[in-house]
Interface confidence: medium
């Protein structure tokens, strides 16, 4: 959730075995800081709906109040609805919690298309399908919002899993995961498997289906195939990484690699699309258009505004190229690549008029704030946020949607020189907050 650019989550969601799933492969045991192997109690603990976010069940307060909370690696506040709202079935009622403590401070969080504000406090928080611990965490009780909550999304709050540097109102507000690690023996690591459905789901299907897994404190080997490849976290604010090369169907975009990371590249579960800087977006679309030129699509499709539809079951996946992002590796001059399919970057949506068709939106869009590796990317992979070692791991997800000809891939190593030069250094300006006003 980059402040100033996007509303929380617009993602895809997954269900029980949908489409083709990859078989398990054996892989060598990596040396992980967290627990290894099976986290049965946390597997399948996420639900969601295409374009509306992945959420986990959490409890807040004493006695516990159960809420569904959006999992967002692009922000750092734990914030929950705390007042009636037309789109909320339930909300956090602070007056009913004997353990709530008011911090007597307000918080205001604006995005480009929406915003929320609320009051800071602390309370006891736990994750029923997570580690068996309870922590006292900072909570922003959302009292007023505009274009933040999504009608029918089934979540009532947001769990910002990024670092304190981007917490609002300032970096002194300890994020939830920091509190969790500090107060318990949970290792400083979590991993996400977001499972795109491959087709639109209605409300009842969403509630009955699985959207993926958030493994807190470790890595579950049943959730991925092959090996995990790690890229360094460049700076601990967003989960910032460095992209060193981009290919469309194996063809290098041949841009100065700084352009790929202008002004940053982040991994953000709270954004639906793969968002690319303007120049990169234009080059990528040109290349994707050329690769898929056997069919002509309206300009509005490439802008993410128009749907394209095919008769059910006839989507021509093969005409669309694969997209590979090369990420800086852990070893000097070594990179690895992650490859996504059109099954990831064409997002299934319901077309009311022609419900017998399979309709899609182009889920790659332009950004003015750098590259955002949103759900489009993450739905192809099991992603390990190894905060302890300041790195992010990628492996092919056991639940990613593919066809009989192609699968998503994580491959390496590749020799890439001068990768440090690919990072963009944001000028340190006095970023005084936009002033608005009070009652």
């Amino acid at each position: 959730t980059q402040h100033g650019i996007r509303l929380p989550l617009r993602s895809g969601l997954g269900g029980a075995p949908l489409g083709l799933r990859l078989p398990r492969e054996t892989d060598e045991e990596p040396e992980e800081p967290g627990r290894r192997g099976s986290f049965v109690e946390m597997v399948d603990n996420l639900r969601g709906k295409s374009g509306q976010g992945y959420y986990v069940e959490m409890t807040v307060g004493s006695p516990p109040q159960t809420l569904n909370i959006l999992v967002d690696t692009g922000s750092s506040n734990f914030a929950v609805g705390a007042a009636p709202h037309p789109f909320l079935h339930r909300y956090y009622q602070r007056q009913l919690s004997s353990t709530y403590r008011d911090l007597r401070k307000g918080v205001y969080v604006p995005y480009t298309q929406g915003k929320w504000e609320g009051e800071l406090g602390t309370d006891l928080v736990s994750i029923p399908h997570g580690p068996n611990v309870t922590v006292r965490a900072n909570i922003a009780a959302i009292t007023e919002s505009d274009k933040f909550f999504i009608n029918g999304s089934n979540w009532e709050g947001i769990l910002g899993l990024a670092y304190a540097e981007i917490a609002r109102p300032d970096d002194s507000l300890e994020p939830f995961f920091d509190s969790l690690v500090k107060q318990t023996h949970v290792p400083n690591l979590f991993s996400l498997q977001l499972c795109g459905a491959g087709f639109p789901l209605n409300q009842s299907e969403v509630l009955a289906s699985v959207g993926g897994s958030m493994i807190i404190g470790g890595i579950d080997h049943s959730l991925y195939t092959g090996s995990l490849w790690y890229t360094p976290i460049r700076r601990e604010w967003y989960y910032e990484v460095i992209i060193v090369r981009v290919e469309i169907n194996g063809q290098d975009l041949k841009m100065d690699c700084k352009e790929y990371n202008y002004d940053k590249s982040i991994v953000d579960s709270g954004t639906t699309n793969l968002r690319l800087p303007k120049k990169v977006f234009e080059a990528a679309v040109k290349s994707i258009k050329a690769a898929s030129s056997t069919e002509k699509f309206p300009d509005g499709f490439w802008l993410g505004e128009q749907l394209v539809c095919w008769q059910a079951g006839t989507t021509p996946w093969n005409i669309f190229p694969v997209i590979s992002l090369y990420l800086m590796g852990e070893v000097t001059n070594q990179s690895f690549r992650i490859t996504i399919l059109p099954q990831q970057y064409l997002r299934p949506v319901e077309d009311v008029a022609t419900s017998q068709d399979d309709c899609y939106k182009f889920a790659i869009s332009q950004s003015s704030t750098g590259t955002v590796m949103g759900a489009v990317i993450m739905e192809g992979f099991y992603v390990v946020f190894d905060r302890a070692r300041k790195r992010i791991g990628f492996a092919v997800s056991a639940c990613h949607v593919h066809d009989e000809f192609r699968t998503a891939a994580v491959e390496g190593p590749f020799v890439t020189l001068d990768m440090e030069d690919c990072g963009y250094n944001i000028p340190q300006t006095d970023e005084s907050t936009l002033m608005t006003g009070r009652a």
Partner: antibody, heavy 124, light 108 residues
């Protein structure tokens, strides 16, 4: 031009009630948070209550909590302050003031403009 | 609650004088401080917001500075229409918001 016009003040006995109104014009009323601020004779300014743009969130000074109720009717562009169980120490000029947005916690916030005020006298 | 302390509570000055009023917060409020001017029998008027930003229409002889706990309102050359009471107000915390006690600027 933004205008705020308070009314409803007057003389009331201790324990009595009064309802103040603030008619707003010149701006999109529902897009702005509003506050009541009072000033006892010869004294300084005291913030009394605030309400968010939608009316969904309300806040009160400890001195009036449980006795005063702030509300708004966005269809009528009007802000209200219902004052019950009035005390002598509630005697003051009551001003309504507009916020810079619908938000109460937008960084760096202020009261602007203010109405001309309405005098409330609580005396037996 | 955050307490706002203004000093002096009153001062006498002549037209053309440079006048400085200070406001101190009981804890850091970053730059979330505003200054208001109130003339007798009138409603307060916003002069400075966010510690140093001049409100539209306010003469440039008014300026604000400070951050954290200590703030200053300066009138570079006092004019006859500036004789009034000045209040500071913090907007850092959640309600209740508090004003300073006021500084009355009188003619010497």
């Amino acid at each position: 031009e933004v205008q705020l016009l308070e009314s409803g003040g007057g003389l009331v006995q201790p324990g009595g009630s009064l309802r103040l109104s603030c008619a707003a014009s010149g701006f999109t009323f529902s897009s702005y948070a509003m506050s009541w601020v009072r000033q006892a004779p010869g004294k300084g300014l005291e913030w009394v209550s605030a309400i968010s743009g939608s009316g969904g969130s309300t806040y009160y000074a400890d001195s009036v909590k449980g006795r005063f109720t702030i509300s708004r009717d966005n269809s009528k562009n009007t802000l209200y302050l219902q004052m019950n169980s009035l005390r002598a120490e509630d005697t003051a000029v009551y001003y309504c003031a507009k916020g810079g947005s619908q938000w109460l916690y937008a960084p760096g916030s202020w009261f602007d403009p203010w109405g001309q005020g309405t005098l409330v006298t609580v005396s037996s | 609650d955050i307490q706002m302390t203004q000093s002096p509570s009153s001062l006498s000055a002549s037209v053309g004088d440079r006048v400085t009023i200070t406001c101190r917060a009981s804890q850091s409020i970053s730059s979330y401080l505003n200054w208001y001017q109130q003339k007798p029998g009138k409603a307060p008027k916003l002069l400075i917001y966010a510690a140093s930003s001049l409100q539209s229409g306010v003469p440039s002889r008014f300026s604000g500075s400070g951050s954290g706990t200590d703030f200053t309102l300066t009138i570079s050359s006092l004019q006859p229409e500036d004789f009034a009471t000045y209040y500071c107000d913090e907007s850092y915390s959640t309600p209740p918001w508090t004003f300073g006690g006021g500084t009355k600027v009188e003619i010497k």
